[in-house]
């Protein structure tokens, strides 16, 4: 019996088509992805093949102005329109709190939303009961398939799930649910979830009875043969894991941002064994036309976004200096504002011993593309912020050793004075440079804000200590020559859309007046 699994993950609000790098579509003839194009391909496959499932492995939320404005209603609407069969909860589904998940998505979705390792307690338990499920048995043709969901247990550090949701270990939580499916005579089981490729592989290895793993969170691109675009494969598609009980379990992911549609064909025997698995992600490029009815719907929803862009988010009473003459040479108050917003967006009081789990921010000065003049009645709009941060990036959470941070700050000024983008703006860090010294030895003082303290204060950086840092995804991926970050990072979790982080902070503060205050000397 042959099953076709179509899958997406980490779409992050890319409802409209995008450029090849998943930023705003500029030249339509070269654009990719988007739900209208996705629908065309899904329908084409549904017409051609008998047993098809369309699955999403989480993180539909967060990433563009679509989410900022519609807050998840757009996800429910368009996923319903595409007739998704199931979705797993990702960490970003909790970005607007549990209410921001329940109302727009859980109550509106016409498909099951799954996670076996999230357990509700207290007053939330009854409120959320039945709105998401540990598993769902879906009829597919003459057969039934069990889908069991999972979500990163790091979600409390990455999002805002509140205190009434417990995130359990994925493997521990999945096994009893899979066992339950087996007792219900369901012998074809897909684990669909959002914990990253390493955990996907562990689930394939350790959870008895899981036949296929469809994952997300790590934006992993897998491909067999010559890849069709710029993404470099992390392995073959599907990636085959040998389970502890001797079965070959295919593991798949489909990069991110709706650029690809994962396409996996599985042949099962009567016992539910995977006899064969093959496929590849399908690049959703302009050779696939956008479905006209979905496209018309997108254009209708788009109107509200254009109006939102010009509305006031808050006010500044000082000039926000985002000029390259400042931000690539010295501490600039736009850099301070952005870093303060980045830390504020990551306030998570999950442990009494820590005032917060992260206190540090670094930001490449070259990523700040425009100032904001306060003489326009102090008004700040989304449009203004889009000029400052035009690349559609995210502000991510990484774990780095102190020694890696030291290398990063040396790189920050290794060719100082040439107006290059690698000069770092900071938050929760005090750095002193001596530019008379030779490159690679210019950082003379590097103090960082403590986290395991009730009164935050600055302590010298320890080379062997592991620190959490918020930074742009551009830097996490080694951009502007920060190869040491990419090579040496110990953990990387993608965060919220850059503009959204700053806009939320400005809306919260109402009036801002960031200063230059001696963070960089």
């Amino acid at each position: 019996w042959e099953l076709t699994i179509l899958h997406t993950n980490d779409v992050h609000s890319r409802l409209e088509q995008t450029s090849e790098d998943s930023s705003k579509c500029v030249n339509a003839s070269r654009c990719m992805g988007g739900v209208a194009r996705l629908f065309t391909k899904v329908q084409q496959i549904r017409r051609a093949e008998p047993n098809v499932l369309l699955l999403d492995a989480g993180d539909q939320y967060q990433g563009t102005i679509w989410f900022t404005v519609y807050k998840g209603a757009e996800v429910a609407h368009f996923m319903n329109a595409l007739r998704y069969d199931a979705m797993a909860l990702g960490n970003h589904e909790f970005d607007n709190g549990v209410e921001g998940l329940i109302e727009p998505l859980l109550k509106e979705a016409k498909f099951p939303i799954l996670s076996a390792n999230i357990k509700a307690k207290g007053p939330l338990a009854s409120q959320i009961s039945g709105l998401y499920l540990p598993y769902k048995v879906l009829p597919v043709g003459d057969e039934v398939v069990g889908i069991v969901g999972y979500t990163s247990k790091e979600t409390p550090f990455l999002s805002n799930p509140g205190t009434n949701l417990v995130f359990e270990d994925e493997i521990t939580a999945l096994q009893p649910e899979v066992d339950k499916l087996k007792t219900l005579n369901v012998n074809k089981i897909i684990a669909l979830g959002h914990s990253g490729f390493e955990m996907d592989k562990l689930i394939a290895q350790k959870v008895r009875g899981v036949d296929v793993v469809v994952g997300g969170h790590s934006n992993t691109f897998l491909y067999t043969g010559n890849p069709p675009s710029k993404e470099v494969p992390a392995g073959k598609y599907p990636f085959i894991v040998t389970s502890d009980d001797g079965r070959k379990v295919p593991v798949v992911q489909a990069y991110a941002f709706g650029k690809y549609l994962g396409y996996l064909k599985i042949e099962f025997d009567e016992r539910g064994n995977v006899i064969s698995s093959h496929g590849n992600p399908i690049l959703l490029n302009s050779s696939i036309p956008e479905d006209p009815s979905i496209k018309a719907d997108i254009n209708k929803w788009r109107i509200k976004l254009d109006n939102y862009s010009t509305q006031e988010l808050g006010k500044t009473i000082v000039y926000l200096d985002g000029s390259s003459q400042s931000c690539r040479f010295r501490e600039c108050n736009m850099g301070n504002l952005i870093c303060d917003a980045m830390i504020n967006n990551n306030l998570r009081h999950t442990d009494e011993m820590f005032w917060n789990h992260v206190s540090m921010c670094i930001l490449n000065g070259g990523g700040i593309r425009s100032p904001i003049d306060e003489r326009n009645n102090g008004t700040i709009t989304w449009e203004n912020l889009a000029a400052v941060l035009p690349f559609g990036g995210t502000f991510d959470l990484v774990q780095l050793k102190g020694s890696t941070l030291k290398k990063a700050f040396e790189h920050s000024v290794h060719r100082y004075g040439q107006s290059t983008g690698e000069f770092l703006q900071v938050g929760g860090i005090h750095v002193v440079y001596d530019l008379s010294r030779k490159p690679g030895d210019r950082v003379v003082k590097l103090d960082v804000l403590c986290t395991k303290c009730r009164v935050p204060s600055y302590d010298p950086l320890k080379m062997d200590e592991v620190y959490k840092v918020i930074l742009p995804n551009f830097l996490a991926n080694g951009g502007d020559g920060f190869q040491m970050i990419k090579d040496e990072l110990l953990r990387h979790d993608s965060g919220d859309q850059d503009i959204n982080v700053v806009s939320t902070y400005i809306s919260k503060m109402k009036v801002i007046y960031p200063a230059v205050e001696g963070r960089i000397k």
């Epitope: 043709g141 003459d142 040998t242 001797g246 025997d269 009567e270 016992r271 064994n273 006899i275 064969s276």
Partner: antibody
């Protein structure tokens, strides 16, 4: 649990036909196909062909084409294999086996003798 | 038709021995190979499917490996109940074909 139950032993004369049945249970019968395999005394296994229950599609090994017919009765989840123009070398145990031979019938002994 | 050449045709081994049986296909069959066990008296049982996946209930001392045209069944430590005849089966293309079998006997 998958179970395949075959009909009893047959003794046939050369030139006659034999029809062996295989009743399946414990799985979604219509979603899969069934194989027929035979084993002559003291010999190895020989694949004869397969039938896809839902559509009645068949694929026969060239060696048996024109002599073998596989049919299905979906109402009783039963597959049949008929072999005609029997000769002595068709004396064998005939097995039905699920789509990728994960489960086997108990075998039906067919003896062709004058 | 794809020919499956299985070797050895028979072997004698003692309890606890490591036993290896090989199947060579006349052309590339990908991963489309099963290993079957037939006990005296006729009962057939699949041990390995898709080259290396172990059927449920089959002891972990059985393992399969290989690719392209060369495939192997290994019994890491032969047990009394393992004395039987073993067959490989390719299902990469029609007609499916079996190896000639390997009879594993007590030394």
């Amino acid at each position: 649990e998958v179970q395949l139950v075959q009909s009893g032993a047959e003794v046939k004369k050369p030139g006659a036909s034999v029809k062996v049945s295989c009743k399946a249970s414990g799985y979604t019968f219509t979603a899969y196909f069934m194989n027929w395999v035979r084993q002559a005394p003291g010999q190895g296994l020989e694949w004869m062909g397969r039938i896809y229950h839902n559509l009645g599609d068949t694929f026969y090994s060239q060696k048996f084409k024109g002599r073998v017919t596989m049919t299905v009765d979906k109402s009783t989840s039963t597959v049949y294999m008929e072999l005609s123009s029997l000769r002595s070398e068709d004396t064998a145990v005939y097995y039905c086996a699920t789509s990728y031979v994960g489960d086997w019938g108990q075998g039906t002994t067919v003896t062709v003798s004058s | 038709d794809i020919q499956m050449t299985q070797s050895p045709s028979s072997l004698s081994a003692s309890v606890g021995d490591r036993v290896t049986i090989t199947c060579r296909a006349s052309q590339d069959i990908g991963d489309s190979l099963n290993w079957l066990q037939q006990k005296p008296g006729g009962a057939l049982k699949r041990l390995i499917y898709a080259t290396s996946s172990l059927d449920s209930g089959v002891p972990s001392r059985f393992s399969g490996s290989g690719s392209g045209t060369e495939y192997t069944l290994t019994i890491s430590s032969l047990q009394p109940e393992d004395f039987a005849t073993y067959y490989c089966l390719q299902y990469a293309s029609f007609p499916w074909t079996f190896g000639g079998g390997t009879k594993v006997e007590i030394k």
